[in-house]
């Protein structure tokens, strides 16, 4: 008979035979034969394989290096890799989160649009007219100018994107 050229899902072709793949969390020890099934063994401590596979070695769990600002977000299993994230005040430099950088601060004239997370940096936006920020901060949004009118005061000095308005008393007309 013709040897198979393709195998079913969760099988692989070797020596003209379809062998079962090893399940996630296990590695290949020996291929199946005409009379025996594929031999698989569980991955060791700190190892994983996350797919049906014919790998002869399991992958090492990712190491979350504290010297790079990393910490474990989710511990790895025999079927999943460890997920790293960054320490408070830091965020990942890439999707793989192999190192961390300090969250950026928004300069005066800019406010925080989106606070940084373990995986994304601070997003700043320029303070629009009517708003200001006079500090460099990773948390502060643009604040609205003070409304002098509500305090029964008048604007003595116009506000900018970096400074609030300065209010003062209204000039009184004498009779």
């Amino acid at each position: 008979p013709e040897p198979p050229t393709a195998c079913r899902e969760k099988q692989y072709l070797i020596n003209s035979q379809c062998c079962s793949l090893c399940q996630p969390g296990q590695k290949l020890v020996s291929d199946c034969t005409e009379f025996t099934e594929t031999e698989c063994l569980p991955c060791g401590e700190s190892e994983f394989l996350d797919t049906w596979n014919r790998e002869t070695h399991c992958h090492q769990h990712k190491y979350c290096d504290p010297n790079l600002g990393l910490r474990v977000q989710q511990k790895g299993t025999s079927e999943t890799d460890t997920i790293c994230t960054c320490e408070e005040g830091w965020h990942c430099t890439s999707e793989a989160c192999e190192s961390c950088v300090l969250h950026r601060s928004c300069s005066p004239g800019f406010g925080v649009k989106q606070i940084a997370t373990g995986v994304s940096d601070t997003i700043c936006e320029p303070c629009p007219v009517g708003f200001f920020s006079n500090v460099s901060s990773a948390f502060e949004k643009c604040h609205p100018w003070t409304s002098c009118e509500t305090k029964d005061l008048v604007v003595q000095q116009a506000g900018t994107n970096k400074t609030d308005v300065v209010c003062g008393p209204q000039d009184r007309l004498r009779a």
Partner: antibody, heavy 113, light 107 residues
Framework: LVQPGGSLSLSCAAS????????MSWVRQPPGKALEWLGF??????????EFSASVKGRFTISRDNSQSILYLQMNALRAEDSATYYC??????????????WGTGTTVTVSS | DIQMTQTTSSLSASLGDRVTISCRAS??????LNWYQQKPDGTVKLLIY???RLHSGVPSRFSGSGSGTDYSLTISNLEQEDIATYFC?????????FGGGSKLEMK
């Protein structure tokens, strides 16, 4: 009884199952000794190809007549140490374990001058 | 070739006894181990395959266990009809090989 250097053919008639679907094997047992696997012939799906143990390779052949459900063992260049009871056996199973699940009654072969 | 060793070539027991027969392989055979019974008249039957799976029609007093290189056949409540020779056989690697047999007799 057969002389050393001589030839002999054994046959084994099967019934009660679809003969061509199964691997068929020959096993022998010298008097007072252990069983010894000699060889098998694969089923139709696997092209009726054969495998043999080193002790008989090149001297013994296995064939089958699937229309009559008969298994054959052709033995050539016989030696005294080939004296034994010869069994035919059906070889079945899955990759989770193959086994000889149906055995013939056995036939005695004596090689002597 | 894989060598199969049955250290006990003969043993005697009484009716109702629990009997265990051992078999050792020269290398790991991954549970590809079968047990056969040969009656005094030469009739051979499969009892257990893949270490512990009972062949159809075999009484439940027969059981098998083991792993790696060491395997055993147990007859839990010996009956007269169990008087026979028992052979182990590895099915992992060609050539298939048998143990030397363990002859069970009645006391």
């Amino acid at each position: 009884l057969v002389q050393p250097g001589g030839s002999l053919s054994l046959s084994c008639a099967a019934s009660g199952f679809t003969f061509s679907d199964y691997y068929m094997s020959w096993v022998r047992q010298p008097p007072g000794k252990a069983l010894e696997w000699l060889g098998f012939i694969r089923n139709k799906a696997n092209g009726y190809t054969t495998e043999f143990s080193a002790s008989v390779k090149g001297r013994f052949t296995i064939s089958r007549d699937n229309s009559q459900s008969i298994l054959y063992l052709q033995m050539n260049a016989l030696r005294a140490e080939d004296s034994a009871t010869y069994y035919c056996a059906r070889y079945g199973g899955l990759r989770q374990g193959w086994y000889f699940d149906v055995w013939g009654t056995g036939t005695t072969v004596t090689v002597s001058s | 070739d894989i060598q199969m060793t049955q250290t006990t070539s003969s043993l005697s027991a009484s009716l109702g006894d629990r009997v265990t027969i051992s078999c050792r392989a020269s290398q790991d055979i991954r549970n590809y181990l079968n047990w056969y019974q040969q009656k005094p008249d030469g009739t051979v039957k499969l009892l257990i395959y893949y270490t512990s799976r009972l062949h159809s029609g075999v009484p439940s007093r027969f059981s098998g266990s083991g792993s790696g290189t060491d395997y055993s056949l147990t007859i839990s409540n010996l009956e007269q009809e169990d008087i026979a020779t028992y052979f182990c056989q590895q099915g992992k690697t060609l050539p298939w090989t048998f143990g030397g047999g363990s002859k069970l007799e009645m006391k």
